[in-house]
């Protein structure tokens, strides 16, 4: 039951994360740059990994897509491409993490690959948070070291002037969302993980000789107690003690990876 | 690199009218600002309007009702009707644009080179 529970609410909280990520990528509100007031009215600039915005305080909201792949700073290629490679891998991990749940059975699906997928999506989940983290603190560095805003200069352009003018860029929203997301996915998949080692079969069975007592037909198994995890039910846990003896191929056994021989 | 192409200025009568355009052209993002300064002989650049593309203007004092400012958003143009104009307003006037670069490059103000304006009694 915890396991499951555990499970469950790794993937709900992953799912929340991931959704969270889209949201960041998709918002225009990774930097901002404060009202500033001029004679004509109030203007508020806002910039997303995708397009510029600019709104007035009349309402009037205007934006424009960045005009090439090519002219864009690397940091920002870097964090576009972080925050995709973190969609990416958590969508596929929320895929994989569907068919892992304990609660939904499909076909014959054994514990084992149960476990196992629940640790992919898991890892999966963890290093999409971490993307998110990381494209968003790659960013949030940028805005602070301010690189393109050191000095107001002006000089002479295409025929005309150019001056820049001095200004600050802050955080916005979406920074923030992308680092609440970031850390929602990256716990979501740390519970997976979790989940992962009470979903894991860690029986230990004892292949054993039969032995054969003079005057009755019993097999004593030594071992026929199973060890368990201590996870979910076991309902194999009995006392194997059979009415005749028999060969160790007869008796039908679930060998795992951590039998001792 | 952003180009402010100026065209419509000339010699005219006083009482006369003209109509400047300014047409920006480039790798343009947010534009917060278009308008016009200009500059008499002998004196300091001043503002003759501006307006938002949301078509909030602003006017030097008395030019308000004289001149008209508006733009097309479509293009990226700016244009300033001058109407009744008088030998003061002779000057070199340059059309203006502040941009938005944001994280690409921060706030800018381009000016263009100017187109001269002579009105003769």
């Known amino acids: 039951m915890a396991v499951t529970a555990c499970q469950g609410l790794g993937f709900v909280v992953s799912l929340i994360g991931i959704a969270g990520i889209i949201a960041a990528t998709c918002m225009d509100q990774w930097s901002t740059q404060d009202l500033y007031n001029n004679p004509v009215t109030a203007v508020f600039n806002y910039q997303g990994l995708w397009r510029s915005c600019v709104r007035e305080s009349s309402g009037f909201t205007e934006c424009r897509g960045y005009f090439t792949l090519l002219g864009l700073p690397a940091m920002l290629q870097a964090v576009r491409a972080l925050m995709i490679v973190g969609i990416v891998l958590g969508a596929i991990g929320l895929l994989v993490s569907i068919f892992a749940l304990k609660c939904i059975r499909i076909g014959s699906m054994e514990d084992s690959a149960k476990a196992n997928m629940t640790l992919t999506s898991g890892i999966m989940f963890i290093v999409s948070g971490l993307c998110a983290i990381a494209g968003v603190s790659v960013f949030a560095n940028m805005l602070v070291t301010n690189f393109w805003m050191s000095t107001a200069n002006m000089y002479t352009g295409m025929g005309g002037m150019v001056q820049t003018v001095q200004t600050r860029y802050t955080f916005g929203a979406a920074l923030f969302v992308g680092w609440v997301a970031g850390g929602l996915t990256l716990i979501g998949g740390v519970m997976m993980c979790i989940a992962c080692r009470g979903l894991a079969p860690e029986e230990t069975n004892y292949k054993a000789v039969s032995y054969h007592a003079s005057g009755h037909s019993v097999a004593y198994k030594p071992g026929g107690f199973k060890a368990s995890t201590g996870f979910g039910s076991n309902t194999k846990n009995k006392k194997i003690y059979d009415g005749g003896a028999r060969t160790e191929d007869e008796v039908q056994s679930y060998p795992s990876k951590h039998d001792y021989v | 690199e952003v180009q402010l192409v100026e065209s419509g200025g000339g010699l005219v009568q006083a009482g006369g009218s003209l109509r400047l355009s300014c047409a920006a052209s480039g790798n343009i993002l947010s534009i917060n600002y278009m308008g016009w300064y200009r500059q008499a002989p002998g004196k300091e650049r001043e503002l003759v309007a501006t307006?938002?593309?949301?078509?909030?203007?602003n006017y030097q004092g008395n030019l308000k009702g004289r001149f008209i400012i508006s733009g097309d958003n479509t293009k990226d143009t700016v244009y300033l009707q001058m109407n009744n104009l008088q030998p003061e307003d002779t000057a070199v006037y340059y059309c203006?644009?502040?941009?938005?670069?944001?994280?690409?490059?921060?706030?800018?103000?381009?000016w263009g080179p100017g187109t001269q304006v002579t009105v003769s009694s």
């Open positions: 307006i938002t593309r949301g078509g909030s203007t």
């Open positions: 203006y644009f502040r941009i938005n670069f944001g994280i690409l490059g921060g706030l800018r103000d381009y």
